[in-house]
Interface confidence: low
Amino acid sequence: KKVVLGKKGDTVELTCTASQKKSIQFHWKNSNQIKILGNQGSFLTKGPSKLNDRADSRRSLWDQGNFPLIIKNLKIEDSDTYICEVEDQKEEVQLLVFGLTANSDTHLLQGQSLTLTLESPPGSSPSVQCRSPRGKNIQGGKTLSVSQLELQDSGTWTCTVLQNQKKVEFKIDIVVLAFQKASSIVYKKEGEQVEFSFPLAFTVEKLTGSGELWWQAERASSSKSWITFDLKNKEVSVKRVTQDPKLQMGKKLPLHLTLPQALPQYAGSGNLTLALEAKTGKLHQEVNLVVMRATQLQKNLTCEVWGPTSPKLMLSLKLENKEAKVSKREKAVWVLNPEAGMWQCLLSDSGQVLLESNIKVLPTWSTPVQP
């Protein structure tokens, strides 16, 4: 008996060939001996089976002795043994129809679980192997689960169902709803304008939801809602914004926030959350702000940074074109009685400068100038 695997919703063509290369009488029946279709001379005739409106053949092939049965929009319950009767012979074909569906939705939030469920006919014992867009293989039986979806899991998942040494392939497009970056850090000198951008890693026709930026300033004991906003068909409208700081928000995607000026009291980390309509859970992006200030008070030249800095970052004070006078893995460095000239305060990571602030130290009889 020949075995053919089919996919739910797809079309399958079961072949039946006669030795005579001409149009002769044939019939296709199911295992209950109910006629599906056949011919009456050069006409196609259909029987009383449940496949009536979904069954067809190719009349153009009859003259060559080929009498296929085409079943459209396959259903799991179409799985059966189909019998072709031609020239006093019977050809049997076992059709097994499988379906593979993603749980609830193919648009899932980052961190959520993807469950793929295999629908299979009674009596079958298939195995399934899926390959994610990032090349990860998952094997299973009736269900396959992938927990903690990552951004790289967005794309086409290719799943192969194996039964009786035959295989059928499914392709499922999964969209992982997430921000492009899980976390970002902005380094700014005191007084500079700060731009926070929150690009999304997906595109959808209509995007509706609401969001909020909570901010935990390094100096504050508790976090604070800096801004709340709505998103309607990709249009952004601010609902509420604190007076200090007074953030500005772009009206279009990507989500874009502007802090008029970086100040030590704003240094810290924020969490932008976006709740999308008809989705449980939220998208998150962490954003960090590091602020630098260089000051000269009497005979003390000080450079300080505020905000979430890693312990491996180096803060140094140096006179332009000279070796660093002081370098420490700390958040404040200073030089007593600095000599006149242009001093640079540098925050660096393995030699790469992340933030720089210049301060001009004048001879002792005058006051400092900050360029």
Epitope: S210, W214, S222, S223, S225, T228, Q243, D244
Partner: antibody, heavy 117, light 107 residues
Framework: QVQLVQSGAEVKKPGASVKVSCKAS????????LSWVRQAPGQGLEWMGI???????NYAQKFQGRVTMTRDTSTSTVYMELSSLRSEDTAVYYC???????????WGQGTLVTVSS | DIQMTQSPSSLSASVGDRVTITCRAS??????LNWYQQKPGKAPKLLIY???NLETGVPSRFSGSGSGTDFTLTISSLQPEDFATYYC?????????FGQGTKVEIK
């Protein structure tokens, strides 16, 4: 639309503890802070403390050591436990969504706690 | 702690009257001030946030002003449903503190 539903009235003896719950629905629970405010009979409003989205707490000095605020994200519920109760703790206890500068915009219906021997 | 002092503690007014309630902070709180309305047996309701911003759904007869230490809540034309107790609250720093309340009664 965010809604906060609190547990029912309680009668306690002095020295006992009370645990009031506040269940949130219709919003993104994990993204906002909740404050607890109490009101003694015929008196004004008194802030007790706040629990942040991360679970961090900030209590008013007056209640430090007697109050504990916790949150259970799986049930979208925040709890306020007050121990060593005395008669002056008789009050209506409210939970409220605290947006920081923009104030407490959503309030629970209140839970009356009576402390009496 | 920041002390909030409201005045008057109570007032009698008629429907249609213009009513003004003041709130004074013991230190500069910029505009971090909110106003609430509370009716007997009910939870407080946010009216004004950040000193002058009207909360969604609150009638436009309510308005707030002030900055620093002195703030005002004004009801331009008192309606029957406005008879209640009003509280100011600072959100400048913890502990958050409320004024003692102003009861608006029918004359």
């Amino acid at each position: 639309q965010v809604q906060l539903v609190q547990s029912g009235a309680e009668v306690k003896k002095p020295g006992a503890s009370v645990k009031v719950s506040c269940k949130a629905s219709g919003g993104t629970f994990s993204s906002y802070a909740l404050s607890w405010v109490r009101q003694a009979p015929g008196q004004g409003l008194e802030w007790m403390g706040i629990i942040n989205p991360s679970g961090g707490t900030n209590y008013a000095q007056k209640f430090q050591g007697r109050v504990t605020m916790t949150r259970d994200t799986s049930t979208s519920t925040v709890y306020m436990e007050l121990s060593s109760l005395r008669s002056e703790d008789t009050a209506v206890y409210y939970c409220a969504r605290d947006l920081g500068d923009p104030g407490m915009d959503v309030w629970g219906q209140g839970t009356l706690v009576t402390v009496s021997s | 702690d920041i002390q909030m002092t409201q005045s008057p503690s109570s007032l009698s007014a008629s429907v249609g009257d213009r009513v003004t309630i003041t709130c004074r902070a013991s230190q500069d709180i910029s505009n971090y001030l909110n106003w609430y309305q509370q009716k007997p047996g009910k939870a407080p309701k946010l009216l004004i946030y950040d000193a002058s911003n009207l909360e969604t759904g609150v009638p436009s007869r309510f308005s707030g002003s002030g900055s620093g230490t002195d703030f005002t809540l004004t009801i331009s034309s008192l309606q029957p449903e406005d008879f209640a107790t009003y509280y100011c609250q600072q959100s400048y720093s913890t502990p958050l503190t409320f004024g003692q309340g102003t009861k608006v009664e029918i004359k």
